[in-house]
């Protein structure tokens, strides 16, 4: 960066090199060049010469003033016009940054994705700070009172092997940057209550010719959790509103869910699950598309083969659930 150049003087910023966005700032340049009394001192921002708000302070120093500085980053350097020099002489440079102090982190969430071996903690960092902001995640055992701290720039994965202080913990997040520091409320967790089952995946779909044609969705999860509640949502791709079916599921076999759908329409399906009675859901699975046939032939769609047509007969046992209408997004 500009900060690594060899200097023949000094450049500094008031109030500081990192400052709150929208502040008035002064950039000072002081030349220290052998046998060069600068006739003029020039400032450059991102390589472009500044022409206004420059004041000569004394023989070797000038000040550049900015009102309401809003750029997140800028490279500043200054030069001197030395007598008998055809080119300006570089004095020094500095990278400057503006931004905001961190907001109080909120919506602190910690989950254990089944088989991951990690507890993943996330939070809402609030508004963009524009400057380097670090987060310290504090994890304190309620049984041993031992506290561990983890430094990160965003979320954190904590190995469950390192959580040796029993099952109950307090978790909170400290956010800090050059402009300030804030701390979240404490979240109390029990490790057994924050497990999210292994991802549920829709593998294929087929529409069976019957008196009333029906579509069967095949889906599965590798979870070992016995009591799992799932939701499947679906809609025509032209619609805004999701329909949601709820299931109490046992994943000892592939799940099959039946739907009575309109012919010749492209539908999209997603599924998600949670351990029954617990707080956290999986994220919705990736979109699975299926187009119902115009008339009676059987149609099969497979995951990641969107809009493909396959023939073949399958007899299946069907999981049925409760149908609701859903405008919800992904619920954590």
């Amino acid at each position: 960066g500009i900060t690594n150049i060899n200097c023949s003087g000094h450049i500094w910023v008031e109030p500081a090199t990192i400052f709150k966005m929208g502040m008035n700032i002064s950039i000072y340049c002081q030349a220290a060049i052998k046998n060069c009394q600068p006739r003029k001192l020039h400032f450059y921002k991102n390589g472009i010469k500044e022409r206004f708000q420059i004041t000569r302070i004394n023989k070797t120093t000038a000040r550049l003033w900015y009102k309401n500085f809003l750029e997140p980053h800028a490279s500043m350097y200054c030069t001197a016009e030395c007598p008998k020099h055809f080119q300006e002489t570089l004095i020094c440079g500095k990278d400057i940054s503006s931004g905001y102090p961190p907001d109080i982190p909120d919506e602190v969430t910690c989950v254990i994705y089944e088989y991951s071996g990690n507890m993943t903690c996330t939070w809402n960092a609030g508004k963009l700070t524009y400057i380097d902001t670090k987060y310290v995640v504090h994890v304190k055992s309620l049984e041993t009172e031992e506290e561990q701290q983890y430094l990160t720039s965003s979320y954190i994965n904590i190995s469950t092997d390192s959580l040796q202080g029993g099952k109950k913990y307090l978790v909170w997040v400290q956010a800090a940057n050059a402009l300030g520091m804030e701390e979240s409320k404490q979240l109390q967790i029990h490790l057994d209550d924050i497990v999210i089952p292994s991802a549920a995946v829709i593998s294929r779909a087929e529409t069976i010719n019957a008196t009333v044609p029906k579509t069967i969705i095949y889906w599965d999860s590798q979870t070992t959790i016995e009591k799992v509640s799932c939701e499947m949502r679906y809609k025509a791709t032209t619609n805004q509103t999701w329909n949601v079916k709820e299931f109490d599921t046992n994943f000892t076999y592939v799940q099959q869910s039946e739907f009575y759908l309109e012919p010749n329409i492209k539908y999209v399906f997603q599924v998600r699950c949670q351990e029954t009675g617990k707080r956290y859901w999986q994220p919705w699975s990736s979109l699975f598309f299926h187009k119902t046939p115009e008339t009676v032939p059987q149609v099969t769609s497979k995951a990641f083969q969107h809009d493909t047509w396959n023939s073949g007969l399958t007899v299946a046992s069907i999981s049925t659930g409760h149908l609701t209408s859903d405008n919800r997004g992904d619920i954590g």
Epitope: A32, I33, C36, Q37, R39, K59, P83, K84, H85
Partner: antibody, heavy 117, light 107 residues
Framework: QVQLVQSGAEVKKPGASMKVSCKVS????????IHWVRQAPGKGLEWMGG????????VYAQNFQDRVTLTEDTSTDTSYMGLNNLRSDDTAVYYC??????????WGQGTLVTVSS | DIQMTQSPSSVSASVGDRVTITCRAS??????LAWYQQKPGKAPKVLIY???SLQSGVPSRFSGSGSGTDFTLTISSLQPEDFATYYC?????????FGQGTKVEIK
């Protein structure tokens, strides 16, 4: 173009003080490094002191360290050289000069100061 | 302090002559050397700066050379207006110092 105009000749008694002015035009005083050089009758040039831009300070020749004071008034772009406790061998022409990359490109016209009882 | 020694202290020459004046520094001054011409009752005038750079407006018959401790001012073909006293001056370190001068006289 820099122009340096000095104050007029002076006659001083031994032990007295003097102050020679040097008015700058063409540039501001903040854009120039003013030095002072003197020349006794029939003798060579002798550097007295001036502003050092590399270190941001006024420096003086050791011979004059205790007796000379260089000051500036940036509001009038005038530089001053004061010399106290004058002796007869301080009789000289005193020049202000604008330093320009290790040399003096611009000089004042000189001020003759005669120290005589 | 750095001592500057000029030689010769005076030189008699005719118009058209080549004149060489030398200046020796008591310690190395890189190329921080200037040469001046001074005529009676006038302020000095810079001829050469940084040992070999010709000051704007100065005739090309004047040239400077050298670095470190030994420096030379050469007037390739002396003209009537060149009869004057010449000084060298170092600007490597404070206090800046002048040579004692070389007077170029008409032979």
């Amino acid at each position: 173009q820099v122009q340096l105009v000095q104050s007029g000749a002076e006659v001083k008694k031994p032990g007295a003080s003097m102050k020679v002015s040097c008015k700058v035009s063409g540039y501001t005083l903040n854009e120039l490094s003013i030095h002072w050089v003197r020349q006794a009758p029939g003798k060579g040039l002798e550097w007295m002191g001036g502003f050092d831009p590399e270190h941001g300070e006024t420096v003086y020749a050791q011979n004059f360290q205790d007796r000379v004071t260089l000051t500036e008034d940036t509001s009038t772009d005038t530089s001053y050289m004061g010399l106290n406790n004058l002796r007869s061998d301080d009789t000289a022409v005193y020049y202000c000069a604008a330093e320009s990359y290790g040399d003096y490109e611009f000089w004042g016209q000189g001020t003759l100061v005669t120290v005589s009882s | 302090d750095i001592q500057m020694t000029q030689s010769p202290s005076s030189v008699s020459a005719s118009v058209g002559d080549r004149v060489t004046i030398t200046c020796r520094a008591s310690q190395g001054i890189n190329n921080w050397l200037a040469w001046y011409q001074q005529k009676p009752g006038k302020a000095p005038k810079v001829l050469i700066y940084t040992a070999s750079s010709l000051q704007s407006g100065v005739p090309s018959r004047f040239s400077g050379s050298g670095s470190g401790t030994d420096f030379t001012l050469t007037i390739s073909s002396l003209q009537p207006e060149d009869f004057a006293t010449y000084y060298c001056q170092q600007a490597n370190s404070h206090p800046w110092t002048f040579g004692q001068g070389t007077k170029v006289e008409i032979k």
